[in-house]
């Protein structure tokens, strides 16, 4: 029942916005809009990991706004009724249904920009977001399975003779802990009601020529390695060093 090994190809790239909050977006530039997109009627779905407490911008299909009839954002969050934010070009009106989270808004006026933004992403923003654009040429969809990531707090210490404990506390999803060299380890994880997971690995090294051990924590938000020198004195506590 160990934690799943994260897919490091999904490591999040963020850029600084307003020198305060990291912001991430999967949006294309206008010049990237392809002429043949109108021929691709298939729905495009993207799995998107986003760090908690950053800003996220979600985009509609790259359709020129002049061709637009209606834009609808459909937002499905866990345990809540589906929220829709719609804009009708002909009457220049917007309408919202079952939308209660004030941090999820249009980036600007929808007649100028159809993108959706989430300000200060929280765990509650885990869910499915879909933009539906109605045009004379048909309906175009782009969906996002948004996975909110929480960086675990990593600690490593020696608590008994030749026994070390590595913890990745309150991460999302669960971190994966590995050791160099491998020891006699017991790893356990706990799922908290706020959606985070704590992983704890306790290892013992019987072989006395092992003097330094490294705990490597893999997580979608980034990897971390800590090392510690094993003390021979029983009961002595020693904290870890960060690579």
């Amino acid at each position: 029942e160990g934690a799943a090994q994260p897919n490091n190809s999904l490591m999040l790239q963020t850029s600084k916005e307003n020198h305060a909050l990291a912001s991430s977006s999967l949006c294309m530039d206008e010049k990237q809009i392809t002429q043949n997109y109108s021929k691709v009627l298939a729905e495009v779905n993207t799995s998107w990991p986003v760090k908690m407490a950053t800003n996220a911008v979600l985009c509609c299909p790259p359709i020129a706004l002049r061709n637009l009839i209606i834009i609808t954002w459909e937002i499905i969050l866990r345990g809540q009724p589906s929220c829709t934010k719609a804009y009708k070009k002909e009457t220049n009106e917007t309408k919202e249904t079952n939308c209660t989270d004030e941090r999820i808004t249009w980036v600007s006026r929808p007649d100028q920009n159809s993108d959706l933004q989430i300000r200060t992403v929280a765990i509650t923003h885990d869910g499915y977001y879909r933009c539906i654009m109605v045009t004379p040429d048909g309906n175009f969809h782009r969906g996002y399975h948004l996975q909110v990531l929480v960086t675990p707090e990593v600690t490593l210490f020696q608590n008994r003779n030749r026994t070390a404990v590595c913890k990745a506390v309150a991460g999302k999803p669960a971190a994966h802990i590995s050791w160099i060299p491998e020891g006699d380890c017991a790893t356990k994880q706990e799922y908290w009601s706020n959606g985070t997971v704590t992983v704890k690995s306790t290892c013992h090294w019987e072989v006395h020529n092992v003097s330094t051990v490294t705990c490597h924590v893999s997580h979608l938000t980034g990897n971390k390695s800590l090392y510690i020198e094993l003390l021979p004195v029983p009961g002595a506590k020693k904290s870890a060093k960060l690579y």
């Epitope: 356990k188 704590t198 306790t202």
Partner: antibody, heavy 119, light 108 residues
């Protein structure tokens, strides 16, 4: 299969100590936390605390910090809870329960030990 | 500490009747879990992660909710459902497990 075995009952005089046991089998003892839960007659459930058999790390509910002491014996895969000086308020069923797997909370419970404090 | 308040404390339902009990949390949660406890037996994990049924739980049970408000529903009451149901949450900061006061379900 996973089993947590507890004695059925303990009778204790007020002011006396008691040590309850919970013998685990059917899984690797050091790979899960062992929790203790109190239930007074006709009342709800209260989490007392938990211990990691791998390294004896303990977390207590502050309410029980001065009342209960948790220990383990890895060689016999047994967890213990010891109470120092019992009063009638401590008369209750005490359950051990396992946590720390892929399911949240306590997926496996012992049958409980009924502690009766009476002169 | 996140306080869980269950209501009603006691309820009774006729066979075939739909039953809903609620659990309110003083602090917002992502997941709520539920235990079933029958008379003189240990509690059993019944519903976890708000809406997932534990192994062996009949399909007439369901769980729902978000934020501070959660519920357990039985769409058609049966005699074997007579029990006390506890909502439950675990928090990592500070480390604490909390149970609601319980809803005792009886049959008419």
């Amino acid at each position: 299969q996973v089993q947590l075995q507890q004695p059925g009952a303990e009778f204790v005089k007020p002011g006396a100590p008691v040590k309850l046991s919970c013998k685990a089998s059917g899984y690797t003892f050091t790979s899960y936390w062992m929790n203790w839960v109190k239930q007074r007659p006709g009342r709800g459930l209260e989490w007392i605390g938990r211990i990691d058999p791998a390294d004896s790390e303990i977390h207590y509910n502050q309410k029980f910090k001065d009342k209960a002491t948790l220990t383990v014996d890895k060689s016999s895969s047994t967890a213990y809870i010891q109470f120092s000086s019992l009063t009638s308020e401590d008369s209750a069923v005490y359950y051990c329960a396992r946590s720390g797997g892929w399911l949240p909370g306590f997926a496996y419970w012992g049958q409980g030990t009924l502690v009766t404090v009476s002169a | 500490e996140n306080v869980l308040t269950q209501s009603p404390a006691i309820m009774s339902a006729s066979p075939g009747e739909k039953v809903t009990m609620t659990c309110s949390a003083s602090s917002s949660l992502i997941y709520m879990h539920w235990y079933q406890q029958k008379s003189s037996t240990s509690p059993k994990l019944w519903i976890y992660d708000t809406s997932k049924l534990a192994s062996g739980v009949p399909g007439r049970f369901s769980g729902s909710g978000s934020g501070n408000s959660y519920s357990l529903t039985i769409n058609s009451m049966e005699a074997e459902d007579v029990a006390t149901y506890y909502c439950f949450q675990g928090s990592g900061y500070p480390l604490m497990y909390t149970f609601g006061g319980g809803t005792k379900l009886e049959i008419k």
